[in-house]
């Protein structure tokens, strides 16, 4: 049907609150501009975390988003979400849209469960 | 015969490397001595992490194991594993045996995936 989007089922954020995971799609077609959206699912609600459009020239995305970054290569996007805290633990879905040229295709991954553990504060140095 | 053993599917270890989770079984029967074993599954292999026998009097277990502790109440055991590091991330299964009096029953949970993130070391205080 639509394009197939694959992403890992589980990722652990680092103790700095950084989680990285790939989002791949197939078939890749001959696409000049690809839009990637990261959504967070809570209960039955989806909220957009960040979105960007990659082109052949613009292979680094999410420049408008302080918490997201990503690099694009062929049909794979390496996503990084930073600034995560324990309350941000949840299911993060990768949506891929082949925007240009037509035809338009859209696909959604099954989601990556990101687990975040807040670090213990370091003891004060007297 | 088998008994039904339930345990959570996922638990996050704290930043101190401590993971706690319940292990419950049913039917509980009228049992004086219950043996609880925690096993770690890696690939197709099971290794014993710790084991203890609870009685009406001995409701605190795993005294021989520095990394395990647990309390027993009716048909529920609250398990705690400590000293965990990122390499210990894995599937931990709770096995329950109703040892005495007969009849003997045994059951195994589906496992709890414990995720462990190593904390960043605190900066040295000069």
């Amino acid at each position: 049907e639509a394009i197939q989007v694959t992403q890992p089922s589980v990722v652990l954020a680092s103790s700095h609150g950084v989680a990285s995971f790939p989002c791949e799609y197939s078939p890749s077609h001959n696409t000049d501009e690809v839009r990637v959206t990261v959504l967070r699912q809570t209960n039955d609600q989806m909220t957009e975390v960040c979105a960007t459009t990659f082109t052949e020239k613009n292979t680094v995305g999410f420049l408008d988003y302080p918490f997201c970054s990503g690099t694009f290569n062929e049909s794979r996007v390496n996503l990084t979400i930073q600034g995560l805290r324990a309350v941000d633990t949840g299911l993060y879905l990768c949506k891929v849209e082949l925007m240009y040229p037509p035809p338009y295709f859209v696909g959604m991954g099954n989601g990556t469960q990101i687990y975040v553990i807040d670090p213990e504060p370091c003891p004060d140095s007297d | 015969e088998a008994i039904q053993v339930t345990q959570p599917s996922v638990v996050l270890a704290s930043s101190h490397g401590v993971a706690s989770f319940p292990c419950e079984y049913s039917p509980s029967h009228n049992t004086d001595e219950v043996r609880v074993t925690v096993l770690r599954q890696t690939n197709d292999q099971m290794t014993e992490v710790c084991a203890t026998t609870f009685t009406e009097k001995n409701t605190v277990g795993f005294l021989d194991y520095p990394f395990c502790s647990g309390t027993f109440n009716e048909s529920r055991v609250n398990l705690t594993i400590q000293g965990l590091r990122a390499v210990d991330t894995g599937l931990y299964l709770c096995k329950v045996e109703l040892m005495y009096p007969p009849p003997y029953f045994v059951g195994m949970g589906n496992g709890t995936q414990i995720y462990v993130i190593d904390p960043e070391p605190c900066p040295d205080s000069d």
Partner: antibody, heavy 115, light 111 residues
Framework: EVQLVESGGGLVQPGGSLRLSCAAS????????IHWVRQAPGKGLEWIGI????????KYAQKFQGRVTISRDNSKNTLYLQLNSLRAEDTAVYYC????????WGQGTLVTVSS | DIQLTQSPSSLSASVGDRVTITCRAS??????????LHWYQQKPGKAPKLLIY???SLESGVPSRFSGSGSGTDFTLTISSLQPEDFATYYC?????????FGQGTKVEIK
């Protein structure tokens, strides 16, 4: 709420040029390709062309090739249609539209080519 | 270019009637299991409104009396029970390849 608003229509002399604008709001403009479509009075819909999200790519219907230019300014959330060498048969309502699985159209702007 | 031919060009019907409009493409508009054929409703002086996308998916907010079917080259828009607000012109559109093309339209009038 997604909105597309066309402007710049009016009366144009045959042989003249027109530049239509389409102001977008309510969404990330730079993320989506936009089309221009026109409709002559009492007639059907006719696709003119498309511009890519970044503005780096355009495609036009054969009949408009060489006479039309679609451009966009992502910093201003605005799309443009330049049509040259106008003739009477270019009289139409011109629409900009975002055509994906959810479609958004502007209200259209009427261009009349007449002397 | 892909040509789209709608039939009939116009029809007269009464409120409550079941109405069927067909759209035939000069070549298949299917690709990777998806049909790139959409249906629009247009009323005089208004912009077109998307009813059905990808041949059979109902656009959000569109009444369920509208349905679409078909694949390849033959497609159908059905209005199960015509309502007064449904009297309008209907267009099919293909978005598989550039140039996008529209059918010539079907005008649904009151009998």
């Amino acid at each position: 709420e997604v909105q597309l608003v066309e402007s710049g229509g009016g009366l144009v002399q045959p042989g003249g040029s027109l530049r239509l604008s389409c102001a977008a709001s309510g969404y990330t403009f730079s993320g989506y390709a936009i089309h221009w479509v026109r409709q002559a009075p009492g007639k059907g819909l006719e696709w003119i062309g498309i511009i890519s999200p970044s503005g780096g790519g355009t495609k036009y219907a054969q009949k408009f090739q060489g006479r039309v230019t679609i451009s966009r300014d992502n910093s201003k959330n605005t799309l443009y249609l330049q049509l040259n060498s106008l003739r009477a048969e270019d009289t139409a309502v011109y629409y900009c539209a975002r055509l994906y699985d959810v479609a958004y159209w502007g209200q259209g702007t009427l261009v009349t080519v007449s002397s | 270019d892909i040509q789209l031919t709608q039939s009939p060009s116009s029809l007269s019907a009464s409120v409550g009637d079941r109405v069927t409009i067909t759209c035939r493409a000069s070549q298949s508009v299917d690709f990777h299991g998806k049909s790139f054929l959409h249906w629009y409703q247009q009323k005089p002086g208004k912009a077109p409104k998307l009813l059905i996308y990808d041949a059979s998916s109902l656009e959000s907010g569109v009444p369920s009396r509208f349905s679409g079917s078909g694949s390849g080259t033959d497609f159908t828009l059905t209005i199960s029970s015509l309502q007064p607000e449904d009297f309008a012109t209907y267009y099919c559109e293909q978005s598989l390849e550039v140039p996008f093309t529209f059918g010539q339209g079907t005008k649904v009038e009151i009998k």
